[in-house]
């Protein structure tokens, strides 16, 4: 990545890290308004299976692992990228390494959910307070989950699908911060590990993933009012370990693995027409990226 100052533009879709032959240190940003990609400052350590989020206009890269020819190291790292300076800086690490982690943000706090350290599949969850640069454990999930999809809706944190070390999961659970407790919600129609999970228009979407046999292109959404999961239009590509985010009322899915190929494809879902379209390609195929959108 380049080390100069990043252009001061509006909302960008950032993609950090990922995997192709080895863990990657790329940071790139897609501008949906003009279809261009920016090459930004590399992560200080390559990582895949990480998660990305934005708090206060800063991009955070959380967890993952560095799978390289020299070895394989799960990461407890939290790193912060400032778009104004195009620089990364390290923050306080998590209590444990978490590869294939999920993250969500409530009230400016980052929740790190599940993930793995070696053969340990975590059910533990911890919360980061940026203003104090501190992590604190909160209540553990009811289920161990790696490759877990995490989303926040109405100040509640949802953990969806994943892998518990034995089985891929269709179960999902919800964390209530005020009570510091988890409760199971309705299970998905489909087993999904490594799915992309996000919130759009008061629904939680789960896109793609792996059911223990095949990569999936199916997509379903959870209505919190009716507590039901309903299928919507499938993606054009089957994919697991994909990146996902929402930009201006549309869902974007980035990359992933289809069982043969590391995808460079970026698809966009329009909820008004219930259709997916190919909008761009990443500069190279990869799985296990961390994705987030800058605030306006």
């Amino acid at each position: 990545g380049s080390m100069g100052h990043a252009p001061k533009v509006g909302r960008l879709i950032y993609t950090a890290g990922g995997y192709f032959r080895q863990s990657l240190s790329y940071l790139e940003a897609y501008n949906p308004s003009d279809g261009t990609w920016l090459d930004l400052a590399d992560l200080q350590v390559p990582r895949s299976g990480l998660a990305g989020c934005v708090v206060g206009g800063l991009l955070y890269a959380v967890g993952g692992r560095n799978n390289s020819p020299d070895g394989n190291t799960d990461s407890s790292a939290l790193d912060c990228y400032n778009p104004m300076t195009n620089q990364w800086s390290p923050c306080a690490p998590m209590s444990v390494p978490r590869n294939r982690i999920g993250v969500g943000v409530i009230d400016g706090h980052i929740y790190a959910v599940g993930g793995s350290h070696g053969c340990i599949h975590h059910n533990s969850v911890e919360r980061y307070e940026p203003e104090r640069d501190e992590w604190h454990l909160v209540a553990p999930m009811l289920t161990r989950r790696i490759g877990v999809g995490v989303a926040v809706l109405n100040r509640l944190l949802y953990a969806v699908g994943g892998f518990d070390g034995t089985n891929r999961l269709n179960s999902a659970e919800c964390y209530y911060p005020e009570r510091n407790e988890w409760r199971m919600i309705t299970a998905m129609n489909t087993i999904r590990s490594g799915a992309g999970v996000c919130v759009l228009h008061n629904c939680i979407y789960a896109a793609g993933g792996y059911d223990g046999q095949d990569q999936l292109n199916s997509v379903e959404r959870y209505d919190v009012e009716t507590e039901t999961w309903t299928f919507v239009a499938p993606m054009k590509h089957r994919r697991s370990a994909l990146g996902i985010t929402v930009h201006q009322g549309r869902i974007y899915v980035l990359g992933g693995y289809d069982g043969h190929t590391f995808l460079d494809s970026v698809e966009c879902y329009d909820p008004d027409t219930d259709t997916w379209s190919e909008v761009t390609r990443m500069t190279s195929g990869r799985s296990g990226v961390g994705v987030a959108v800058t605030m306006e």
Partner: antibody
């Protein structure tokens, strides 16, 4: 019946290349990680490489990293080990294995294919 | 890398004997340990997974146990078909590593 059948072994000169194949039947390789384990003549077992069916990530022993490449073609239900820059110390029987019952124990093994690196 | 130190390297026993083979991990590996049996010219076969779970179809005379970083394979009453080489394997931490093997021979 679950079966893994390796092929592609043989005699190769130092610095040469071979591609091993592992054809699976009775289960889908997309449903399991696939590993290669080798055993030098009269010696013990050594884990070589693996591929994750969900993320596509691969792992390698330090002794082969940068020289060997594991891959899988789920449409053919076959895994591969491309071995380049072969050395005398790579001489071994190569087994294709799959952990299906438990994530960390290989319950399905092929019969093995012998790779001999010698001039 | 985690070392799995297996002992003894060989032992002689008679049919009906109780046989114990030990593997000591150089650091914690939780219960991510498996045991295999290998006969000459054949591929290894899984006996025990998760330190103490008996694999389907394996006779109940085989058992596994864990005490900290010490793992034990026990054959309660050795049978003629049990004369073979036995290996432990840890998969707790990358890279997965095997013990050097224990050859069980007829006394």
């Amino acid at each position: 019946e679950v079966q893994l059948v390796e092929s592609g072994g043989g005699l190769v000169q130092p610095g040469g290349s071979l591609r091993l194949s592992c054809a699976a039947s009775g289960f889908a390789i997309s449903a399991s990680s696939i590993h290669w384990v080798r055993q030098a003549p009269g010696k013990g077992l050594e884990w070589v490489a693996s591929i994750d069916p969900e993320t596509g990530e691969t792992l390698y022993a330090k002794s082969v990293a940068g020289r060997f490449t594991i891959s899988a073609d789920t449409s053919k239900n076959t895994a591969y080990l491309q071995m380049n820059s072969l050395r005398a110390e790579d001489t071994a029987v190569y087994y294709c294995v799959a952990p299906r019952v438990d994530l960390y124990a290989a319950d399905a093994w092929g019969q093995g294919t012998l790779v001999t690196v010698s001039s | 890398d985690i070392q799995m130190t297996q002992s003894p390297s060989s032992l002689s026993a008679s049919v009906g004997d109780r046989v114990t083979i030990t593997c000591r991990a150089s650091q914690s590996v939780s219960s991510a340990v498996a045991w295999y049996q290998q006969k000459p010219g054949k591929a290894p076969k899984l006996l025990i997974y998760s330190a103490s779970s008996l694999y389907s179809g394996v006779p109940s005379r085989f058992s596994g146990s864990r005490s900290g970083t010490d793992f034990t394979l026990t054959i309660s009453s050795l049978q003629p078909e049990d004369f073979a080489t036995y290996y432990c394997q840890q998969s707790y931490s990358f890279p997965s590593t095997f013990g050097q093997g224990t050859k069980v021979e007829i006394k």
